[in-house]
Every structure is written in C-alpha cells, then in structure tokens.
C-alpha cells in the first residue's frame, strides 16, 4: 500500500521533516533540527532555551510556552517567587531568608527546624559522630567526648596516628582508627617490618645450578659452585 | 549572625614578622575549631593552622610549611583568633582567611581575607 | 596528607546546561568531603558538606554525591551567577587539604 499512502500522496511533512508509516493511513514525521509539529509546521521556538531556572519549554503554533517549577514565575520563569514577601512563613522571630526557587528560616537561639518551630535541645539528637558522646552544657551549647582516636567539635575528625610510628626498614606507615599498620618492603616482615623474610624458604629455587641459598638481613645471597657466578650462580 | 573579619596583613621583607587577627562575632567562639587558610596568588587554597575548641583544650595543629615559623592562638574575652607569622619568605605571599570549622566536615564561615606580601 | 585530585581544572557550559566536577581522594575519607565556590576577589563560600548535605542557604541545584575515595558535584542548570572557580576539600584529618580547584565559565 506503500504509493497510495499519505507519506507519497500528500507529503505531510514539511520543512524538510521524514515521514514513517506507521500504518495503512497513519504516519509520523521526524523533524530536521528547529522544527516541531505533527507536521514540522512550526518553527521550535525552543531551540533558543528561552525557558529559565530549570522550566520546561514546549512549542506551540511557533511560540514557546514555559512550565516553572515551583518557586519562580514569569513568561521565561525568569522571576523569582519570594515566599518572604508572605507573613509567617518563619515562626518564634525567626528570619525568612529567600533563596532561589524556595526560601529557609534562620532561627532565634532556643529554635529549631524548617520553619523554627521546634525547640532546641542541645543532645536531642545528638550531633556527636563516629561513637561520641554528648554532654549539654547549656541551655543551648554541648560538648562530644570521642571515642579515642577521633576529635573534632562532633568527634568528625579521624586522628593521623602515623606521625609517631615506628615502622622500620623503609616500612611505610598506613593511618587506621586509633591504631596504624605498616607496609613493609618484600624483604621485610612483622608489625614494624622489622622481621627478615627469608627468601631461601619462600623461594626453594633462588639459587641455580647447584648454589647454595643464604638468608640475610633484608635479603639474600646465593654460595656458588663448579665455575657458576652471578646473583643467582646462573653466570 | 555569623561574623568574621580579618586585618593586619601587609608589606613586609623576607625575615620579618606579622601578626593577623580575625575578629568574630554571632556564635559562641570557644565551642568550635578555628583555621587559618591561605591562597597565593593565581593558586588553589592551602590549610595552614587550627586551634581547636574548648573542649580540646583549645589545642593547635600546623602544616608542615608554617610549622615552628607560625603560632595561632585566640582571645576567648575579645573572640579573636590571632596568626602569628615570622621568619616570612616570599612564598608565604598569599591572601589570609580565617574561617570557622562547622564539625561537620566543612568550613561554614570565612573572613574577607587579609592580604600578605612579603618581598624586598 | 591525603592528596587531592580534582578534574577537570576548567570548563565552559551554557546556560541551563548541567556540569559534573570530581574529586578523588588519595586514601578513603568515608564521606568527609566539602564543596566550595569562590568568586573573584571574594572568599570560599560553603557548598556542600559531609559530601552530600546542602549548606543552609545554597540553592538545590547543587548536588554532591560520593563515597570512599570518589566524589563528585553536580551542578543542574548552570546560572550567571555560577561561574567562579569550585574547590573540593576533605576534612576527615589533618592537614585539611584541598584540589586544585576548577574554574566553571559561561558560553
């Protein structure tokens, strides 16, 4: 049916736009860039992005119209809206600050909460982190006592236990909770890397050509026999 | 309201000494760290020093480039945190802020800055 | 000190247009991460804390997000008023230490 149908006989799609049947009678038109439309009538008056803060810009008959979300208005949902032009918005004294598409409350001591209407209790929750403890101080003040390796005014902060550490023999200092570990070199073994590897055991083989494996400090060394030179008697 | 404001920076030769202030206001001053943050010019921002809270004995701790060379320290009367600089080189040219640690991973309040220029 | 590497050191995005800077940390600082701006000639001001929460008086399109030694800031709808450089900073020890920072301008 493909001659007879709308996509040859009428051409619908104008501006350049591509027709696909969809069935014996019905089509749908793709639209070169700039165009919108059933029938890519209409010039897209989106394709400047005039819509603003986030809106959402629709095309119709060769305007743009703008969905705002909610906390702005105007033809481009340029406009802020400020909610503290509106009374009450902040109870118990607090200020009514506007911000971008919404508004916050900053609050009087004592309050709390989005709109200060709740009380402030210093412990209640506590702002204490990583296991800390709190203790109220005040009508309005506390004061965290950390879990040993932490600090910070909320017990935030991890303690660095590695500048004092006693990683030996080139061991590099890794920082944990309250504690470190030390990375050691291959040749080295040990909480503090001070322990030698030996390489003779861990590898059977090391010495070649009938050498003998000695294990040293941070290393080893290979005996050799019948003529064999080399780190390795392989020479 | 949350305030704080740094003076005291200057020309100054290399060898010499300054001392900075930060002037707070709008909390209680002895419940939270304070940190001295540095930014030469053109560059990123550099942690310098911090004097911890009451709690912790109002405490300090440096970065190894200002360490023994910088002292920070504070009136708790006239809520006023001090950086006091010598041994100056030109590399500690740089803008000083001073700026409140909120406890909760971030620095919440900052200083206008106060400008350092230490060149002969 | 845990390094900072932040990316990427500068960018140039349209209006309305959303951006993504990361952060990635030298060592895991389990979430304690900030996000600042600074405009010109001004100081820091605070963005994000805790690596995900919104300062109290920063607009919502600004989003953090991350763990471990991975963060990013997402900014949803570039505004005018956004340009300026973004700095990421971890503050789970000391020394504080902060990325290079990257600096965000309008097409």
């Known amino acids: 049916y493909s001659t007879s149908h709308p996509c040859f006989v009428s051409r619908p799609c104008l501006n350049g736009g591509t027709c696909h049947m969809l069935s014996r009678d019905t089509y749908e038109c793709t639209c070169q860039v700039g165009f919108t439309g059933k029938e890519c009538q209409w010039t897209d008056a989106c394709l400047s992005h005039p819509c603003a803060n986030g809106s959402t810009c629709t095309t119709v008959a060769n305007q743009f119209s703008c969905k705002c979300l909610t906390g702005f208005t105007g033809q481009k949902c340029e406009t802020d809206v400020n909610e503290c032009d509106i009374p009450g918005h902040c109870q118990h004294g607090g200020t009514c600050l506007n911000l971008p598409g919404s508004y916050q409350c900053q609050c009087p001591q004592g309050f709390t909460g989005q709109y200060c209407d709740s009380l402030y209790v210093p412990c209640a929750p506590s702002p204490c982190v990583n296991g800390g403890t709190c203790r109220q101080t005040g009508d309005f003040t506390f004061e965290c006592n950390c879990l040993p390796g932490f600090e910070g005014s909320t017990c935030e902060r991890n303690i660095d236990d590695c500048p004092n550490h006693r990683c030996q023999n080139g061991g590099v200092c890794v920082d944990g909770v309250n504690t470190y570990n030390c990375r050691c070199p291959p040749q080295w073994t040990g909480q503090f890397c001070t322990e030698d590897v030996d390489e003779c055991l861990l590898q059977p083989n090391a010495c070649q050509n009938g050498g003998t494996c000695a294990n040293r400090n941070g290393g080893y060394g290979c005996v050799c026999v019948n003529g064999w030179s080399g780190d390795d008697c392989s020479e | 309201e949350v305030k704080l404001v740094d003076y005291g920076g200057g020309l100054v030769q290399p060898g010499a000494s300054l001392r900075l202030s930060c002037e707070v206001s709008?909390?209680?001053?002895?419940?939270?760290?304070m940190e001295w943050i540095r930014q030469a010019p053109g560059k990123g921002l550099e942690w310098i020093a911090a004097s911890r809270n009451k709690a912790n004995n109002f405490s300090i701790v440096y970065s190894a480039s200002v360490k023994d060379r910088f002292t920070i320290s504070r009136d708790t009367y006239k809520s006023i945190l001090y950086l006091q600089m010598s041994t100056l080189k030109p590399e500690d040219t740089a803008v000083y802020y001073c700026?409140?640690?909120?406890?909760?991973?971030?620095?919440?309040?900052w200083g206008q800055g106060t400008s350092v220029i230490v060149s002969s | 000190d845990i390094q900072m590497t932040q990316s990427p050191a500068s960018l140039s995005a349209s209006l309305g247009e959303t951006v993504t800077i990361q952060c990635q940390t030298s060592?895991?600082?389990?979430?304690?991460l900030a996000w600042y701006h600074q405009k010109p000639g001004k100081s820091p001001q605070l963005l994000i804390y805790g690596a995900s929460r919104l300062q109290d008086g920063v607009p919502s399109r600004f989003t953090g997000s991350g763990s471990g030694t991975q963060y990013s800031l997402k900014i949803s709808s570039m505004q005018t008023e956004d340009e300026g450089v973004y700095f990421c900073q971890q503050g789970f020890k000391y020394p504080l230490t902060f990325g290079s920072g990257t600096k965000l301008e309008i097409k």
């Open positions: 709008g909390f209680t001053f002895s419940d939270f760290y």
């Open positions: 060592e895991d600082i389990y979430s304690g």
């Open positions: 700026s409140r640690d909120s406890g909760r991973w971030g620095l919440d309040a």
